[in-house]
């Protein structure tokens, strides 16, 4: 006569995390009597996950009905499953006893595998701006994915980018695992419409990979180029001198006018033109009366950017004899420019 | 699906006696037989249970004079040094008690003990 | 050893009364619901009712319905019908597969 066998079917399933799953166990016999039992682990430290005689397991639910006559069917579902779930389950029949029940047979396991999605992707940049031909580091992040197996790309404008390096913690086994890759991007002076975007695909998303985007528009300092020159005279008396600003970006950017040396008028850049590139242009008007300087006047147009050291252009404005002898007091006046393109 | 016992009648004190149990329309393999008694006018009285051969369990007072088998069709119960208290109508029923309680009965058989 | 005691040892009650037969155990009963009731008709077999306590058998009517739990437990026969004239008996289970004991039976007569 042969005695209770205790089946498990499978040797493994895989669930996606916040299902249900299924652990499938049978026995042959009715004897002896004594109740079931599952167990997520082997060994003394094993975690009881249910117990047909006794207790609240809130998650658990029999597939069958347990007080049916003749049930051999001691097959459980556990609710919302979640990667910490993962782990190698365990039937097994209890034989009555006193004063406590003795374990009678195991089943074989299964082991639960548990698919969880990737987190989406955080794609983060570098703290400081770096101007064209520089390299600029950035960090895409996902957490939480179950299995380990994972395909990770880095996009610049829609291609793929070969330079970066990704690891997938930890090592060993998990119930969940994080991936972080770092790739590195050559800047260029047309970046600040650029993307970076951090694909990430698993088998959890169904061939709908996640992105993390990034603009490099937060990662470029694109530094201004000036040139001052002197318009045509509205009057005998007036010099017209512009600086023209051009190309740069972020917006931030403070003008200074010097006349030999001497600031003459400090302003800060509102209304720009935006190139199609994302960069800016902008022009900066001053009106000398050369009839208040005895000698040539040196213009210096000095550019504060992003916060970054000054740069200046200069441009002598020569006095003719005519003006000089006419000049009297040192007077001048100056006009902002109206916004214009270039 | 029924028990049909077998075996019973008169047997002096001292005496033993074999009874049989045959099951119809299900097979024994899985189930627990198990045996009551009951004596003229009285109560019901358990005997124990025949699982399979290394699952067998009897009541206290009944360990050593009483000892059961099984095949996959009929059980057994085999009674040694009887005595008049013995005397009952004693019956096989399918079952193992607790979850796996005792749900298809023979309709029992009498062993009377008397000299 | 478990031992079970059945209260009253006998009754008598009319058609579609309310009966209700408690059963008392020595110590919690295994697993608090190693209980079944069982129906005996003289000169016949016993047939199971009730099982794991509250556990309805197949077959029996809806009338009948057990609850309890440890050490206290009652069967109750909602509308006592013609045919429910029989003696019940509870079989209670220790924590030893050997250790389950039936009460003395409860006798229910016609009133």
């Known amino acids: 006569e042969d005695e209770l066998q205790v089946i498990q079917p499978e040797k493994s399933v895989s669930v996606a995390a916040g299902e249900s799953a299924t652990l499938r166990c049978a026995m042959t016999s009715l004897i002896p009597v004594g109740p079931i039992m599952w167990f997520r682990g082997a060994g003394a430290g094993r975690e009881l996950i249910y117990n047909q005689k006794e207790g609240h397991f809130p998650r658990v639910t029999t597939v069958s009905e347990l007080t049916k006559r003749n049930n051999l069917d001691f097959s459980i579902s556990i609710s919302n499953i979640t990667p910490a779930d993962a782990g190698t389950y365990y039937c097994v029949k209890f034989r009555k006893g006193s004063p406590d029940d003795v374990e009678f047979k195991s089943g074989a396991g299964t082991e639960l595998s548990v698919r969880a999605k990737p987190s989406a992707p955080v794609v983060s940049g570098p703290a400081v701006r770096a101007t064209p031909e520089h390299t600029v580091s950035f960090t895409c992040e996902s957490h939480g994915f179950s299995p380990r197996d994972i395909t990770l790309k880095w996009f610049k404008n829609g291609n793929e980018l070969s330079d970066f390096q990704t690891n997938v913690d930890p090592a060993g086994d998990s119930v969940s695992y994080s991936i972080h890759s770092t790739a590195r991007v050559v800047l260029t002076r047309g970046d600040v419409h650029s993307q970076v975007i951090c694909e990430i695909a698993h088998i959890t998303l169904q061939g709908d990979p996640l992105r993390g985007t990034a603009n490099l528009s937060e990662a470029i300092r694109v530094p201004p180029t000036l040139e001052v020159t002197q318009q045509p005279m509205r009057a005998e008396n007036q010099a017209n001198v512009t600086c023209q600003v051009s190309n740069f970006y972020p917006r931030g950017l403070q003008l200074t006018w010097l006349e030999n040396g001497n600031v003459s008028r400090t302003e800060t850049a509102s209304t720009l033109i935006e190139n199609k590139d994302g960069t800016y242009n902008w022009m900066s008007w001053l009106l000398v009366n050369t009839c208040a300087h005895r000698d040539d006047v040196v213009l210096t147009c000095q550019v504060e950017h992003d916060g970054q050291q000054a740069v200046s252009k200069s441009y002598a404005l020569e006095i003719s004899a005519h003006q000089k002898e006419h000049g009297s007091d040192i007077t001048h006046e100056a006009a902002l420019a109206p916004t214009a393109p270039l | 699906r029924q028990l049909v016992e077998s075996g019973g009648g008169l047997v002096q004190p001292g005496g033993s006696l074999r009874l049989s149990c045959a099951a119809s329309?299900?097979?024994?393999?899985?189930?627990?037989i198990s045996w009551v008694r009951q004596a003229p006018g009285k109560g019901l009285e358990y005997i124990g249970t025949?699982?399979?051969?290394?699952i067998t369990y009897y009541a206290s007072w009944a360990k050593g004079r009483f000892t059961g088998s099984k095949t996959s069709s009929t059980a057994y119960l085999q009674m040694t040094s009887l005595r008049a208290e013995d005397t009952a109508v004693y019956y096989c029923?399918?079952?193992?008690?607790?979850?796996?309680?005792?749900?298809?009965w023979g309709q029992g058989t009498l062993v009377t003990v008397s000299s | 050893d478990i031992v079970m005691t059945q209260s009253p040892s006998s009754l008598s009650a009319s058609v579609g009364d309310r009966v209700t037969i408690t059963c008392q155990a020595s110590?919690?009963?295994?697993?608090?619901?190693?209980l079944a009731w069982y129906q005996q008709k003289p000169g016949q077999a016993p047939k199971l009712l009730i099982y794991?306590?509250?556990t309805l058998a197949t077959g029996v009517p809806s009338r009948f319905s057990g609850s309890g739990s440890g050490t206290d437990f009652t069967l109750t026969i909602s509308s006592l019908q013609p045919e429910d004239f029989a003696t019940y008996y509870c079989?209670?289970?220790?924590?030893?597969?050997?250790?389950?004991?039936f009460g003395q039976g409860t006798k229910v007569e016609i009133k």
């Open positions: 794991l306590a509250s």
């Open positions: 079989l209670g289970g220790g924590d030893d597969e050997a250790d389950n004991t």
């Open positions: 029923a399918r079952g193992s008690a607790w979850n796996d309680p005792f749900d298809y």
């Open positions: 329309g299900f097979s024994l393999s899985s189930h627990g």
């Open positions: 110590q919690s009963v295994y697993g608090n619901n190693d």
């Open positions: 025949i699982g399979t051969g290394v």
